[in-house]
């Protein structure tokens, strides 16, 4: 598994997936209605 400082930090932050890769941030629009269009 990855043992670089970055990977350790991510692992500590709970951001690693089971496969050991960093989970990609999903774009989930929050407060859509607070934005005009």
């Amino acid at each position: 598994s990855c043992n670089t400082a970055t990977c350790v930090t991510h692992r500590l932050a709970g951001l690693l997936s089971r496969s050991g890769g960093v989970v990609k941030d999903n774009f989930v629009p929050t407060n859509v209605g607070s934005k005009a269009f």
Epitope: V28, P29, G33
Partner: antibody, heavy 115, light 108 residues
Framework: EVQLQQSGPELVKPGASVKMSCKAS????????MHWVKQKPGQGLEWIGY????????KYNEKFKGKATLTSDKSSSTAYMELSSLTSEDSAVYYC????????WGQGTTLTVSS | EIVLTQSPTTMAASPGEKITITCSAS???????LHWYQQKPGFSPKVLIY???NLASGVPARFSGSGSGTSYSLTIGTMEAEDVATYYC?????????FGSGTKLEIK
């Protein structure tokens, strides 16, 4: 420059379906939701729903469930709206509009339902 | 569904006049969910004010918005000929998002 280019006017018969498009450019397509709005001739604005192109998640006005279907194609940065079982009540201008406070709307697609 | 009631429905104003359009919501909404649009004849709508009081990019400073709860307003400090349009409020607090029925502003 952000642009939303909508497909041209449509003349269709009652009972048919139509699929209109909204091609986005000038921004990252997956970073904003795309809204669709209906405006009958001489009348006000009615929100149909929106699609999140990142994951194709949708939210609809209950009134348009079963009438409108929103989809998107990331590869071409294009949002689509299909309207089914058309009646004269569906004759209107349909706008796409980018979510976010910057106020970008398409020019509108005029749909005429007539036999 | 939240119903937005605008008044007046139609109004005519002289150049230089101060204009106020009101928008009353059937349920209380947070100001961050209330927006105003302008639609000139033959054109797409455009956002004027977002989150009740924030001026959208490129909108003249004579436009302003205020309000809270169920009562909101759009003000034009000094009416100009180019302001002839229909104005709509819109709420994004609950789905379905809804628009007011519009206020048509004409010039005397």
């Amino acid at each position: 420059e952000v642009q939303l280019q909508q497909s041209g006017p449509e003349l269709v018969k009652p009972g048919a379906s139509v699929k209109m498009s909204c091609k986005a450019s000038g921004y990252t397509f997956t970073s904003s939701v795309m809204h669709w709005v209906k405006q009958k001739p001489g009348q006000g604005l009615e929100w149909i729903g929106y699609i999140n192109p990142y994951n194709d998640g949708t939210k609809y006005n209950e009134k348009f469930k079963g009438k409108a279907t929103l989809t998107s194609d990331k590869s071409s940065s294009t949002a689509y709206m299909e309207l089914s079982s058309l009646t004269s009540e569906d004759s209107a201008v349909y706008y796409c509009a980018k979510g976010g406070n910057d106020g970008y709307w398409g020019q509108g697609t005029t749909l005429t339902v007539s036999s | 569904e939240i119903v937005l009631t605008q008044s007046p429905t139609t109004m005519a104003a002289s150049p230089g006049e101060k204009i106020t359009i009101t928008c009353s919501a059937s349920s209380s909404i947070s100001s961050i969910y209330l927006h105003w649009y302008q639609q000139k004849p033959g054109f797409s709508p455009k956002v004027l004010i977002y989150r009740a009081s924030n001026l959208a990019s490129g909108v003249p400073a004579r436009f302003s918005g205020s309000g809270s709860g169920t009562s909101y307003s759009l003000t034009i400090g000094t009416m100009e000929a180019e302001d002839v349009a229909t104005y709509y409020c819109q709420q994004g607090s609950t789905i379905p998002f809804t628009f007011g029925s519009g206020t048509k502003l004409e010039i005397k």
